[in-house]
């Protein structure tokens, strides 16, 4: 069976029907490049005006304008708000009332696209394997990133969160139109990784999505992650404005000027430092979501009532912090280089500025306890990775899981740890699962490109697709069309249950209290330490166009502009695990 032309609110669209075998039978309808919204520079997205005739939805559209990896050029385009749909089909009748899984890509809110990285037309976020193996509809889409997606003056002149609003527009489009493709508009699961996972979390917390989202999956990221909310957007807006020659004293004039500046210039005016800086690299993630008083009306920790009826899976990779550790402490990955106590202390203090000297010392002490017995470089390097993993991913995810569970009405809560080791040959032998290592398995790459993978990789992929799509279908990862290797029990506040995802998943893979000692440290010991306040006014970004990044505000978690009043009104916020 195949859909043919589908009538949407924008008009007719026609994709392609791809047979899954030479013998006929099952197939997948694929639609690429359906417009879901339009947007002007640094403005909220608007609904698309539609088209006449039949739109041929056969090619991915360009990604949203962003800097290249080298950060010296741009690619993509401003006209980028398009989505892609995969609909599995059986032999006879077209699919009807299928669960819908909407993917939100990661990339530090700075880069990425709905189709993902591409090697010889093999796109990372190709939804075919998930759709056909799990019998679900998969949707991917583009949203604005970098300054064009998240630049904010912290007030009504440039409220920011444009990229989040793009995401919302895509989810709302799916709600309104997916029935025409054979999807169930009342069974939408949003899922994402890294910045996409934090986006998933933020979308579930936003009042704008009331009634749109049934379930959610966050892979390595949460709204509570220290890198997910910019607490001092004006600082970074001024940095960009100076670079492109816009006034900075009046936010209204600054916003007006930025909106008519060449979008490529805005994009290139910001560079993420990839060489070691004074502070950990995540502090330089400038253009990320903000508490705007509207789309995100309050600190995320206060918005968990909005998730009471949204089933949630959240988890991390066991060495998610490795990617960040290699930038902050480059010796971590180099066998011939050593990590020193001083290196680690500098990293710790950079992540605990809100609590000053006492915070840094207490944190350093608990993380280096094992060093007395085992002062080996391997142990020290693993400590660095564990620390970054805890701070950036584990602790925020654990707090979020607890919040979700505590506020749940009908909602179910599940937790996982992805531990299938990285396949990167250049990594140390002690390496676990790095940040983003889970993506290839969720998207079924071991099946799509079998020559590049081992049987054990296919086992991991099969299990993840089964759990993920069962969850999308029923709200329970164990119940659905796909058999699973073991029963995944829900998360409880008492036991902190989680599924450890490895190449061999058995009943022993259900574990409890992940890194409980460290969780207690961050949530209790560290939390009660007195907060120190820095001086915002001493910060000066570099005048020239060099690679040197400005010092991030030292107390950037403490000072939150309260929209829609101007940025000079500052509300003191309690520290959330020190960020």
């Amino acid at each position: 069976a195949k859909l043919g032309a589908v009538y949407t609110e924008g008009g007719f669209v026609e994709g392609v029907n791809k047979k899954l075998s030479l013998l006929g039978g099952d197939s997948v309808d694929i639609f690429k490049g359906i417009p879901f919204a339009t947007a002007k520079t640094l403005e909220n997205p608007q609904r698309h005006p539609g088209w006449q005739g039949t739109l041929k939805a056969t090619n991915f559209k360009k990604r949203c304008l962003q800097a290249t990896i080298t950060q010296d050029n741009t690619y993509g385009q401003e006209d980028c708000l398009y989505l892609n749909i995969w609909v599995p089909q059986g032999r006879k009748q077209v699919s009807h009332n299928l669960p819908v899984m909407v993917w939100i890509y990661g990339g530090a809110f700075l880069m990425g696209s709905g189709q993902g990285a591409n090697f010889l037309k093999n796109y990372l976020y190709d939804g075919e394997e998930i759709a056909t193996r799990g019998n679900v509809i998969v949707v991917t889409f583009n949203y604005r990133v970098g300054p064009l997606g998240f630049l904010s003056t912290g007030d009504a002149n440039l409220p920011g969160n444009f990229g989040l609003r793009d995401q919302h527009m895509a989810i709302a489009w799916v709600k309104r139109n997916i029935a025409a493709f054979g999807g169930d508009p009342d069974n939408i699961t949003i899922f994402g990784e890294s910045a996409g996972a934090a986006s998933v979390s933020l979308q579930t917390l936003s009042p704008y999505n009331k009634g749109l989202i049934r379930r959610a999956i966050s892979q390595s990221g949460m709204a509570l992650s220290p890198w997910a909310i910019q607490k001092n957007p004006l600082f970074w807006a001024k940095t960009i404005a100076k670079k492109v020659g816009c006034p900075t004293e009046d936010t209204g004039k600054m916003a007006a000027c930025l909106k008519i500046t060449d979008p490529r210039a805005l994009t290139l005016a910001y560079k993420l430092p990839v060489k070691k800086q004074e502070y950990p690299v995540v502090h330089y993630l400038a253009f990320i979501p903000v508490i705007d008083g509207d789309f995100i009306p309050d600190d995320p920790i206060n918005l968990y009532n909005n998730t009471a009826d949204i089933d949630y899976i959240a988890g991390i990779n066991n060495m998610d912090g490795h990617l960040f550790a290699t930038i902050d402490v480059p010796a971590v990955d180099k066998t011939k280089q050593t990590v020193t106590e001083e290196d680690f202390y500098r990293l710790v203090s950079g992540h605990t500025v809100a609590k000053g000297l006492k915070g840094a010392q207490a944190t350093f002490d608990i993380y280096t306890e094992s060093w007395a017995q085992d002062p080996s470089q391997e142990n020290m390097k693993k400590t660095v990775v564990a620390f970054e993993t805890d701070v950036l991913f584990l602790i925020p995810t654990e707090i979020a899981l607890a919040q979700h569970k505590a506020h749940a009405k009908s909602a179910k809560t599940y937790s996982y740890l992805f531990s299938h080791p990285s396949r990167m040959p250049i990594y140390p032998k002690w390496m676990g699962a790095d940040h983003a290592d889970d993506l290839q398995y969720v998207f079924g790459k071991p099946f799509a490109t079998p020559l590049g993978y081992r049987p054990q990789d296919r086992a991991v992929s099969k299990a993840m697709i089964a759990y993920w799509t069962n969850f999308a279908r029923s709200g329970d990862p164990n119940m659905g069309n796909s058999p699973v290797p073991t029963h995944w029990y829900p998360y409880t506040l008492e036991n902190g249950n989680y599924l450890d995802i490895t190449k061999t998943i058995t009943s022993a893979s259900m574990k409890e209290h992940l890194r409980e000692k460290f969780l207690k440290f961050w949530a209790v010991t560290f939390e009660v330490l007195p907060t120190v306040t820095g001086d915002q006014d001493t910060l000066t970004p570099p005048e020239d166009d060099s690679e040197v990044a400005p010092d991030p505000p030292s107390d950037d978690s403490q000072v939150v502009p309260v929209p829609p009043t101007d940025d000079s009104v500052e509300a003191q916020m309690p520290a959330t695990i020190g960020f």
């Epitope: 032309a5 609904r47 005006p49 006449q52 005739g53 039949t54 709600k175």
Partner: antibody, heavy 119, light 105 residues
Framework: QVQLVQSGAEVKKPGASVKVSCKAS????????MHWVRQAPGQGLEWIGV????????SYAQKFKGRVTMTRDTSTSTVYMELSSLRSEDTAVYYC????????????WGQGTLVTVSS | DIQMTQSPSSLSASVGDRVTITCSAS?????LNWYQQKPGKAPKLLIY???SLPSGVPSRFSGSGSGTDFTLTISSLQPEDFATYYC????????FGQGTKLEIK
């Protein structure tokens, strides 16, 4: 100017089929979708479906799937709506209506065709 | 399908009155239009995209709203305005409100 001229009134017996035509003029026929909407006596408006005259693509309201067929003849700039297995509740005025622009409202309407289903 | 609920179902008013008709969608919608229909005639487009007037429609007609709640306002009723008004949402499965009959008081 845009004109949509529909065929005349029809009286049909239950179980029969009816085919209503709508001839378009004053614009490029293949450039705009054509919708069919009906209105039972004293009742509101009900969308039946839509056809793209360019390639013949159609979409029907769930309620009418399996009973309705929309076709077009580009040589005469005419669209047709055929409804089968008629029942008394199909008695209504049937309108063709052209899109105004883009994905837009129904900007131009035919004069309507009364279809009466009676034994 | 998205349900469209108009209120009131009917109302009586006098020439010169200001009249408001509301339309509520069962879920958030992108495209909302208003039509006027007189007895024995085809509907006529009055407002599109919630607030835009097609050429030839008098400026006393205005529309507003977004999301799920929309309003049609006639600022000063004229004799030719007595008719039935329908809201219409444009989605993959378009639907109409049940209509509001505007009668002379």
């Amino acid at each position: 100017q845009v004109q949509l001229v529909q065929s005349g009134a029809e009286v049909k017996k239950p179980g029969a089929s009816v085919k209503v035509s709508c001839k378009a003029s004053g614009y490029t026929f293949t450039s705009y979708n054509m919708h069919w909407v009906r209105q039972a006596p004293g009742q509101g408006l009900e969308w039946i479906g839509v056809i793209n005259p360019g390639d013949g693509a159609t979409s029907y309201a769930q309620k009418f799937k399996g009973r309705v067929t929309m076709t077009r003849d580009t040589s005469t700039s005419t669209v047709y709506m055929e409804l089968s297995s008629l029942r008394s509740e199909d008695t209504a005025v049937y309108y063709c209506a052209r899109d105004y622009y883009g994905s837009s409202p129904l900007g131009y309407w035919g004069q309507g065709t009364l279809v009466t289903v009676s034994s | 399908d998205i349900q469209m609920t108009q209120s009131p179902s009917s109302l009586s008013a006098s020439v010169g009155d200001r009249v408001t008709i509301t339309c509520s969608a069962s879920q958030s919608i992108s495209y909302l239009n208003w039509y006027q229909q007189k007895p024995g005639k085809a509907p006529k487009l009055l407002i599109y995209d919630a607030s835009s007037l097609p050429s030839g429609v008098p400026s006393r007609f205005s529309g507003s709203g977004s999301g799920t709640d929309f309003t049609l306002t006639i600022s000063s009723l004229q004799p030719e305005d007595f008719a039935t008004y329908y809201c219409h949402q444009r989605s993959s499965s378009p639907t109409f409100g049940q209509g509001t009959k505007l009668e002379i008081k």
